[in-house]
Amino acid sequence: SCNTATCVTHRLAGLLSRSGGVVKDNFVPTNVGSEAF
């Protein structure tokens, strides 16, 4: 799967949307690597 910074950002946005924004404060693109997905 795509692990560029932009892909990670979009995947994280989707995850935040599906979770209703209920995630850890540090769960942001620059803190999470591709391994988070």
Partner: antibody
């Protein structure tokens, strides 16, 4: 309101260096990658590279390695791009851009910095 | 590097028409494609990400489709303010690359 405010136009001589700034506001600067893009006159867009403001880790387009250096100053929420050994081929508009999720999910671009390299 | 190719550099359309801008990737990029609109004297504006998702605030007359190597930006009910150049971009792998652009002219 999210804003990426870039420094003003630059007129520099061949062989010189220049440092362009991009000041971010309205979001947490360290949370999102900052991209830099070149647009030569009448031409398409070229991705230069990106930087993780959280740790300073960069990814460059091979074409711009040795030409561009990306840095950040977290204390002022400002990203920088230094271009060196300038030639007329470097004359272009340079943009910073960042995809933000919070407060608004959008791909924000700075207003562009025009660089003219001429003797 | 992945090459993104717009099939047409210029397209002419009329207000109220429907127009499709196409872009082809030199290799499979999945759905990792964005579309940008650039008006004269302005910064590029993001319209579409992940091939088919509109950013908030983008009018719903802009629709993205495609996956793999073939992508399309469709503008329904074209308005005079849609006069602009449109670029595709792949972000599936580094370096990110943009297409050469398609200039939309309004008759």
């Amino acid at each position: 309101e999210v804003q990426l405010q870039q420094s003003g136009p630059e007129l520099v001589k061949p062989g010189a260096s220049v440092k362009i700034s991009c000041e971010a506001s309205g979001y947490t600067f360290t949370d999102y990658y900052m991209n830099w893009v070149k647009q030569s006159h009448g031409k398409s867009l070229e991705w230069i590279g990106d930087i993780n403001p959280n740790n300073g880790v960069t990814t460059y387009n091979q074409k711009f390695k040795g030409k561009a250096t990306l840095t950040v100053d977290k204390s002022s929420s400002t990203a920088y791009m230094e271009l060196r050994s300038l030639t007329s081929e470097d004359s272009a508009v340079y943009y910073c851009a960042s995809i933000i999720i919070v407060p608004d999910y959008f791909d924000y671009w700075g207003q562009g910095t025009t660089l003219t390299v001429s003797s | 590097d992945i090459v993104m190719t717009h099939s047409q550099k210029f397209m002419s359309t009329s207000v109220g028409d429907r127009v499709s801008v196409t872009c082809k990737a030199s290799q499979n990029v999945g759905s990792n494609v964005a579309w940008y609109q650039e008006k004269p004297g302005q910064s590029p504006k993001a319209l579409i990400y992940s091939a088919s998702y509109r950013y908030s605030g983008v009018p719903d007359r802009f629709t993205g489709s495609g996956s793999g190597t073939d992508f399309t930006l469709t503008i329904s009910n074209v308005q005079s303010e849609d006069l602009a150049e449109y670029f595709c971009q792949q972000y599936n792998s580094y370096p990110y690359t943009f297409g050469g652009g398609t200039k939309l002219e309004i008759k």
